[in-house]
Amino acid sequence: EPPTACREKQYLINSQCCSLCQPGQKLVSDCTEFTETECLPCGESEFLDTWNRETHCHQHKYCDPNLGLRVQQKGTSETDTICTCEEGWHCTSEACESCVLHRSCSPGFGVKQIATGVSDTICEPCPVGFFSNVSSAFEKCHPWTSCETKDLVVQQAGTNKTDVVCGPQDRLRA
């Protein structure tokens, strides 16, 4: 009876279990009743990092110097290239696909410390009573407007991203 499931590092095809290709190799042809799975090593600038049945290897990531990127670790047939940013610059994400001089603080956060040549911007969440409605690399959280000092009342509460909205006091009718 043909198998319905295969062991680890195997795959099911044409009612039989074939060996997967090892990392660094791609599939050329599936196994048959008489032959083993045929695999070939990935090319120079290619890789596959898992046991697989891929017919094409993945291209190594390109660390584009025009984006401020450089190679941190050269790729192998089993691993992708790892990029990093030029000295003094910071990756925009874990994948490091582009570089910024320093990060900015999103709405709801203020700048605690402006970036220097050796340290990135330090952001802090705006506490209750303060807000920031912009992305910035220098602006702190701003205090909510004090409606009372303008002889007004709060019509809409503030948040960490928005100021309070002030309005006129309700006059009592005689």
Epitope: N66, L67, G68, C85, E86, W89, T92, S98, C99, V100, L101, H102, R103, S104, V134, S135, S136, A137, F138, E139
Partner: nanobody, 116 residues
């Protein structure tokens, strides 16, 4: 495509003044915080001054406070840096930059040399 074109640099004597300009295109200038950043020969990048999108709030590094003034004209898509009482240590290439400071969005800069 974002383009930032700095101009106004040159050779000036200590105590002199210069006004740098940065012409911006390829993005909505009035929506962005803008910065002036400089790089002295053989040194790293130093953040000099910044201005919020509306031009109502500014930041200055301690080294230039009271001497430099940042401003912007959103109708002309232009950023300015008025530099007074220039010192030898202000010698650098000056760049304007927009948030979020992508490497590939920087201009060529303008060279300011302060020397007698």
């Amino acid at each position: 495509e974002v383009q930032l074109l700095e101009s106004g640099g040159g050779l000036v004597q200590p105590g002199g003044s210069l006004r740098l300009s940065c012409a911006a295109s390829g993005f909505t200038f009035r929506d962005y915080e803008m910065w002036w950043v400089r790089q002295a020969p053989g040194k790293g990048l130093e953040r000099v001054s910044a201005i919020n999108p509306q031009g109502t709030r500014t930041y200055y590094a301690d080294s230039v406070k009271g001497r430099f003034t940042i401003s912007r004209d959103n109708s002309k898509n232009t950023l300015y840096l008025q530099m007074n009482s220039l010192r030898a240590e202000d010698t650098a290439v000056y760049y304007c930059a927009k948030l979020p400071f992508y490497f590939h969005e920087w201009g060529q800069g303008t060279l300011v040399t302060v020397s007698s």
